[in-house]
């Protein structure tokens, strides 16, 4: 991250490039590859996360049981197109003219096809399930102070409402983070529940994308808690269209 | 009911060093980063310091770094201030504060301090 | 470095309703009331619009955009005081600071 001047820098997206040419002087930060102005007292969406991270230089990089639409990305990472507003556009598109349709938090829900494949609307991702194995500890930790400090986590680090914090499930060493936010509960100035996972993931990863005092510390009773494995999957409002040579 | 209590303050030399202490009582001390913050006479509120729960993690007011040493000891529900060099411009009331918010990215702000302790004056002259 | 901007002082009536704003931070914002100098600090609004248990409802904190508002619907005489508000400076080193401190007088 370079910014224009040293004092101008965007404490919730390392991932930017700010000067102070906003109103009245003040700090203005635009996100590296897209340009777009983001606001630094909240989350930058995926998508132009995504969209800058491909732009920077390249560098080395009770359980629920999730049903047959959950999704998991397997793609990896792409250089998206996102609208005015940073959401992913329906419609995705490689180089060679290889497209494929996307739900909220750009994950490939259709098979790939050519030019002609149209994507009718950006379907929604309601319920997001983070899958984590800690590592080992002296012994499992309790249930309710594990739950209360990964609900304060999202509420206090990511800033999502606790309603959307549906369920912390736990069966040592797997740990259950439910996240569902429905289209009708979004409302305006919500974190989406695709964006506060996006950075939980970066965050386990080692790869926070907040500047100042960056890294997770995570505690349960003053009992480090950490993550060496994560696994999410994503349920859309609308099942996913894959041919059935995909699923054999 | 929360209660920060500091000690430590007093008449001190310039150059010197000093070593503040709050105890801590009313609240689960470990689940809470803590702030030290100064007055000096007739001036403003001037934050010093903070130090995240487990005290993995400081970070202090330019006018301090390098001359400022935050620790906490979790089991006996106290914070600690070490400062040297000490300087004319290090006079002034120390109050211990709690922060509300540990996991915030923004978790340094000033504007999580949910509780204060009474203060202990440092007065630097020689 | 970043400087949280309050206003010197304002001055209301019993039961009328007061407003101090502070700009040039982030997200997290606090009021702190001060009655006389040296003596220890009360939070009035912490973390934006939470308020402490033992401070009375007519104190209230709004958050638009960059700029927090400490609002005091139906002020009172014991109310004057000195009002400090606090944020982040997100400047590198993203440190704690506090405004200058609004001073208000109850006529």
């Known amino acids: 991250h370079t910014a224009a001047q040293d004092n101008c820098t965007c404490p919730t997206n390392k991932m930017t490039v700010c000067s102070p040419d906003g109103p009245g002087g003040r700090c203005q930060c635009r996100a590296l590859g897209s340009g777009v102005a983001v606001d630094c007292s909240t989350l930058t969406s995926k998508c132009l996360l995504l969209k800058a991270r491909m732009s920077a230089p390249k560098n080395a990089r009770t359980l629920v049981r999730p049903n047959e639409h959950a999704l998991v990305d397997n793609d990896g990472l792409y250089d998206p197109d996102c609208d005015p507003e940073g959401r992913f556009k329906a419609r995705q598109c490689n180089q060679t003219s290889v497209c494929w349709c996307v739900n909220s938090v750009g994950v490939r829900r259709t098979d790939k096809g050519d030019l002609s494949l149209r994507c009718d609307e950006l379907v929604r991702t309601h319920h997001i399930l983070i899958d984590l194995r800690h590592r080992p500890t002296a012994g499992a930790f309790n249930h309710s102070d594990l739950d209360a400090e990964l609900r304060r986590l999202f509420r206090e680090r990511y800033r999502l409402h606790p309603k959307f914090v549906a369920a912390v499930h736990y069966e040592q060493p797997t740990i259950q983070i439910e996240l569902r936010q429905n289209t009708s509960q979004k409302a305006a100035g919500d974190v989406d529940i695709g964006d506060a996972a996006y950075y939980f993931e970066r965050d386990v990863k080692g790869e926070s994308l907040f500047q100042g005092r960056g890294g997770l510390d995570l505690r349960v009773r003053g009992e480090p808690l950490q993550v060496e494995r994560t696994l999410i999957y994503y349920l859309d409002e609308i099942p996913p269209k894959f041919s059935m040579k995909r699923l054999t | 009911a929360v209660t920060l209590d500091e000690s430590g303050g007093g008449l001190q030399t310039p150059g010197g060093g000093l070593s503040l202490v709050c105890k801590a009582s009313g609240f689960d001390f470990i689940d809470y980063d803590m702030f030290w913050v100064r007055q000096a006479p007739g001036k403003g509120l001037e934050w010093v310091g903070v130090i995240n729960r487990s005290g993995s993690y400081t970070n202090y007011a330019p006018a301090v770094k390098g001359r400022a040493t935050i620790s906490r000891d979790n089991g006996q529900s106290t914070l600690r201030l070490q400062l040297n060099n000490l300087r004319a411009e290090d006079t002034g009331t120390y109050y211990c504060?709690?922060?509300?918010?540990?996991?915030?990215?923004?978790?340094?702000?000033?504007?999580?301090?949910?509780?204060w302790g009474h203060g202990t004056e440092v007065i630097v002259s020689s | 470095a970043l400087a949280l901007t309050q206003p010197s002082s304002v001055s209301a009536n019993p039961g009328e309703t007061v407003k101090i704003t502070c700009s040039g931070g982030?997200?997290?914002y606090g009021w702190y009331q001060q009655k006389s100098p040296g003596s220890a600090p009360v939070t009035v609004i912490?973390?934006?619009?939470k308020r402490p248990s033992n401070i009375p409802s007519r104190f209230s904190g709004s958050l638009s955009g960059s700029t927090n508002t400490l609002i005091i619907t139906g002020v009172q005489a014991e109310d004057e005081a000195v009002y400090f508000c606090?944020?982040?400076?997100?400047?590198?080193?993203?440190?704690?600071?506090f405004g200058a401190g609004t001073t208000l007088t109850v006529l």
């Open positions: 504060a709690r922060g509300a918010c540990t996991h915030c990215w923004d978790a340094d702000s000033a504007g999580y301090i949910d509780a």
């Open positions: 912490y973390w934006n619009d």
């Open positions: 606090g944020g982040y400076d997100s400047s590198p080193g993203y440190v704690g600071i």
């Open positions: 982030y997200s997290g």
